[in-house]
């Protein structure tokens, strides 16, 4: 909608592990920056949302048949790991330096 | 894209190239099956929507703060090519056997 700020982009999302019940096994950190992909995949899809051909096609079909076909969606297209200290199966505190797929690196229209 | 009540799944989407203005350069086919990813990414995320860790986290945060954080989105996670006969830069009919990323192979929650 109004302004570039509403187009698909990465926005802050601080996640507290207590809020999602993961504090029972994640010792540290208490919270982390997960980021969230927010905003619209509007026509015309800009290069910075790295649209697939299918996303471009769907966007064009949506223009003609908006009640039948949805817009493409703004989602994480690349994720980053975080480091966590967690309790293993035996309850032993263990460091996992690369806990993959926890934080958004890039967003795009898919 | 988002759906009302059903869970994230692949649904039919027949695309006519004339409807999106691509008939000016794509000679054949006249239309193709693009498929569309439709439905919601509801808790708990099932294995068949192959959720990333970030999608799981976002889903859990959405449960606690539904007005602040959106659900994960149902999008194509794997695309397939189609074969097209198109006009090249010189207007010569050319066959492209693998025109990548045009049809949904799999949907998931991201």
């Amino acid at each position: 909608s109004t302004g570039a700020g509403s187009h698909c982009q990465k926005t802050s999302l601080r996640v507290n592990f207590e809020d999602i019940g993961w504090n029972s096994w994640i010792i540290a950190p208490k919270e982390y920056e997960a980021y969230e992909c927010k905003g619209g995949c509007f026509f015309p899809l800009a290069d910075d949302v790295t649209p697939t051909k299918h996303a471009i096609v769907q966007t064009l079909v949506h223009l003609k048949f908006p009640t039948k076909v949805g817009k493409a969606c703004c989602v994480p297209t690349k994720l980053s790991p975080i480091s966590i200290l967690y309790k293993d199966d035996m309850g032993v505190p263990t460091l996992k330096y690369h806990y993959e797929g926890m934080s958004v690196a890039e967003c795009g229209c898919r | 894209s988002t759906g009302a009540g059903s869970h994230c799944q692949k649904t039919s989407l027949r695309v006519n190239f004339e409807d999106i203005g691509w008939n000016s350069w794509i000679i054949a086919p006249k239309e193709y099956e693009a498929y569309e990813c439709k439905g919601g990414c509801f808790f708990p995320l099932a294995d068949d929507v192959t959720p990333t860790k970030h999608a799981i986290v976002q889903t859990l945060v959405h449960l606690k703060f539904p007005t602040k954080v959106g659900k994960a989105c149902c999008v194509p996670t794997k695309l397939s090519p189609i074969s097209i006969l198109y006009k090249d830069d010189m207007g010569v009919p050319t066959l492209k056997y693998h025109y990548e990323g045009m049809s949904v192979a799999e949907c998931g929650c991201r």
Epitope: S1, P66, G70, K71 | T2
Partner: antibody
């Protein structure tokens, strides 16, 4: 500054026709979606029709087949051709600019023009 | 079509009160929700776009929140000029649809 000025309203008999115009200024008209929104006396807002910056047009079910939206980008003017008018079409008709090339928030509105359908 | 339901349909409040109006969409519209203010005999005015973004020139006492199907417009401290009717509208897709309106009256 952005300005939208509607004209063409008036009294018309049921079954009659009317053409509304909306003269736009202060922005690149062709780059924005434009809508018509109406408000019956004492009632809420009802979206009527939209023309996207892409040229696509869409209508509310209540006017589909009777109303036609169009735009002349060279004249910076939006139109609404209303045919087969009914008593329930009586309303103030507003022209509104979408904030983007497709459906979006309506960030600027005209002052409205009154259409009365009565015998 | 996406139905928009506002509540309450009317409310009475005093200057300085905190006022909350809610809007519910019949299906997920993510954050494509806008709020308008309309005074008698005048055209509507955009207050909030995309659920939580304040339109330029709108006082900061107005705020919006929500995502998916449930949205809220809050006026933190009601001023005399805020007595009006408020409408929500979804811009997720065509047909665009409005809520039925909430009239804010002086108590």
């Amino acid at each position: 500054q952005v300005q939208l000025l509607e004209s063409g309203g008036g009294l018309v008999q049921p079954g009659g026709s009317l053409r509304l115009s909306c003269a736009a200024s202060g922005f690149t008209f062709s780059s924005y979606a434009m809508s018509w929104v109406r408000q019956a006396p004492g009632k809420g807002l009802e979206w009527v029709s939209i023309t996207l910056g892409t040229g696509h047009t869409h209508y509310a079910d209540s006017v589909k087949g009777r109303f036609t939206i169009s735009r002349d980008n060279s004249k910076n003017t939006l139109y609404l051709q209303m045919n087969s008018l009914r008593a329930e079409d009586t309303a103030v008709y507003y022209c509104a600019r979408g904030s983007y090339i497709i459906w979006s928030a309506l960030d600027y509105w005209g002052q409205g023009t009154l259409v009365t359908v009565s015998s | 079509d996406i139905q928009m339901t506002q509540s309450p349909s009317s409310l009475s409040a005093s200057v300085g009160d905190r006022v909350t109006i809610t809007c519910r969409a019949s299906q997920d519209i993510r954050s494509y929700l806008n709020w308008y203010q309309q005074k008698p005999g005048k055209a509507p005015k955009l207050l909030i776009y995309d659920a939580s973004n304040l339109q330029s020139g709108v006082p900061s006492r107005f705020s919006g929140s929500g995502s998916g199907t449930d949205f809220t417009l809050t006026i933190s401290s009601l001023q005399p000029e805020d007595f009006a009717t408020y409408y929500c509208q979804q811009s997720d897709t065509s047909p665009l649809t409005f809520g039925q309106g909430t009239k804010v009256e002086i108590k």
